[in-house]
């Protein structure tokens, strides 16, 4: 499955939108920084079969979509930007779902992939727990926004490596 060029453009657009969503100066939030233990190894395309990498990407985008689709998220961000961001993520999910179906037919996805997906889910659980502990404060959301920008950048790099493998 070849991810369309529009997919990586969508990812870049999502990153730009997320960058524009900030409501307060991040300079006031240094003390709120937190180690979410991003599972960097899951974004290393070299150790994966293509089907596995696509599944990890799908999980990453799905969890990001879920995080920004909550009521708490709606209260935190400017509505029109949030809607545009969610639309970009939804389009990416559609692209990836088509690829997952196609690739899983070609390669048998080993158990190792389940571990990778679980690692991504646990990462997002840590983010959600942090937001709950910080009572969804503006600074907590700023920290999470910065963290998601970072993980989306990792996703973009993984997509680039996947295209080079084709």
């Amino acid at each position: 499955c070849d991810l369309p060029q529009t997919h990586s453009l969508g990812n870049r657009r999502a990153l730009i939108l997320l960058g524009q969503m900030g409501r307060i100066s991040p300079f006031s939030c240094l003390k709120d920084r937190h180690d979410f233990r991003i599972p960097q190894e899951e974004f290393d395309g070299n150790q994966f079969q293509k089907a596995q990498a696509i599944s990890v990407l799908h999980e990453m985008i799905q969890q990001t979509f879920n995080l920004f689709s909550t009521e708490d998220s709606s209260a935190a961000w400017e509505q029109s930007l949030l809607e545009k961001f969610s639309t970009e993520l939804y389009q990416q999910l559609n692209d990836l779902e088509a690829c997952v179906i196609q690739e899983v037919g070609v390669e048998e996805t080993p158990l190792m992939n389940e571990d990778s997906i679980l690692a991504v889910r646990k990462y997002f659980q840590r983010i959600t727990l942090y937001l709950i502990e910080r009572k969804y404060s503006p600074c907590a959301w700023e920290v999470v926004r910065a963290e998601i920008m970072r993980s989306l950048s990792f996703s973009t790099n993984l997509q680039k490596r996947l295209r080079r493998k084709d």
Epitope: G19, G22, S25, P26, F27, C29, L30, K31, D32, R33, H34, D35, F36, E142, V143, A146, E147, M149, R150, S153
Partner: antibody, heavy 121, light 107 residues
Framework: EVQLVQSGAEVKKPGESLKISCKGS????????IGWVRQMPGKGLEWMGI????????AYSPSFQGQVTISADKSISTAYLQWSSLKASDTAMYYC??????????????WGQGTLVTVSS | DIQMTQSPSSLSASVGDRVTITCRAS??????LNWYQQKPGKAPKLLIY???SLQSGVPSRFSGSGSGTDFTLTISSLQPEDFATYYC?????????FGQGTKVEIK
């Protein structure tokens, strides 16, 4: 390879203006903040201020607020430190350094080589 | 502003010595503390971040500890290239502040 390359040494007279630069390469320039640090001759490190190149938001140390201006041009991955009217006491080495912003990553992990500014009549 | 106080301001030691530098913050900074090494005519170099994390490429003889207000940088066995000035820096809030520095000299 991550690099911060600063502009060359400057010799100026009191009252003159000056703008020094710091060009980032080997990483996504807008994903990190750029801080400026002063070191006067034989003295320690003093944090002056910082900029987020993604939106040019700035924060200054109270000691330097109104004395200098920090700016950035993300299209050329460059941050700037400028003075409108230099004083002899501005004579120092000025360093730029990369900061991860709100991400859990090392602070000031890469530094420029420094720009020596000499202000003398 | 948060004041950072280092001690001693200078020390003399021999190659192979265990060296300890302390840094005290005027208020709690949790673990938001970094240590830098600076050699004459060179830019500072990050050694330790978040109080105890060793920066990539830094020799394991360097270690950091502490939280709250009291922090320590330890060099387990001083090497010739370690003679330099060391600075602590708090990163919990603006304005970011550095300690005044500790110069490690050859005995």
């Amino acid at each position: 390879e991550v690099q911060l390359v600063q502009s060359g040494a400057e010799v100026k007279k009191p009252g003159e203006s000056l703008k020094i630069s710091c060009k980032g390469s080997g990483y996504s320039f807008t994903s990190y903040w750029i801080g400026w640090v002063r070191q006067m001759p034989g003295k320690g490190l003093e944090w002056m201020g910082i900029i987020d190149p993604s939106d040019s938001d700035t924060a200054y140390s109270p000691s330097f607020q109104g004395q200098v201006t920090i700016s950035a041009d993300k299209s050329i991955s460059t941050a700037y430190l400028q003075w409108s009217s230099l004083k002899a006491s501005d004579t120092a080495m000025y360093y730029c350094a990369r900061h991860p912003g709100l991400n859990w990553a090392p602070d000031f992990d890469y530094w420029g080589q420094g720009t020596l500014v000499t202000v003398s009549s | 502003d948060i004041q950072m106080t280092q001690s001693p301001s200078s020390l003399s030691a021999s190659v192979g010595d265990r060296v300890t530098i302390t840094c005290r913050a005027s208020q709690s900074i949790a673990e938001f503390l970094n240590w830098y090494q600076q050699k004459p005519g060179k830019a500072p170099k990050l050694l330790i971040y978040f109080a105890s994390s060793l920066q990539s490429g830094v020799p394991s003889r360097f270690s950091g500890s502490g939280s709250g207000t009291d922090f320590t940088l330890t060099i387990s066995s001083l090497q010739p290239e370690d003679f330099a000035t060391y600075y602590c820096q708090q990163s919990i809030d603006f304005p970011l502040t550095f300690g005044q520095g500790t110069k490690v000299e050859i005995k």
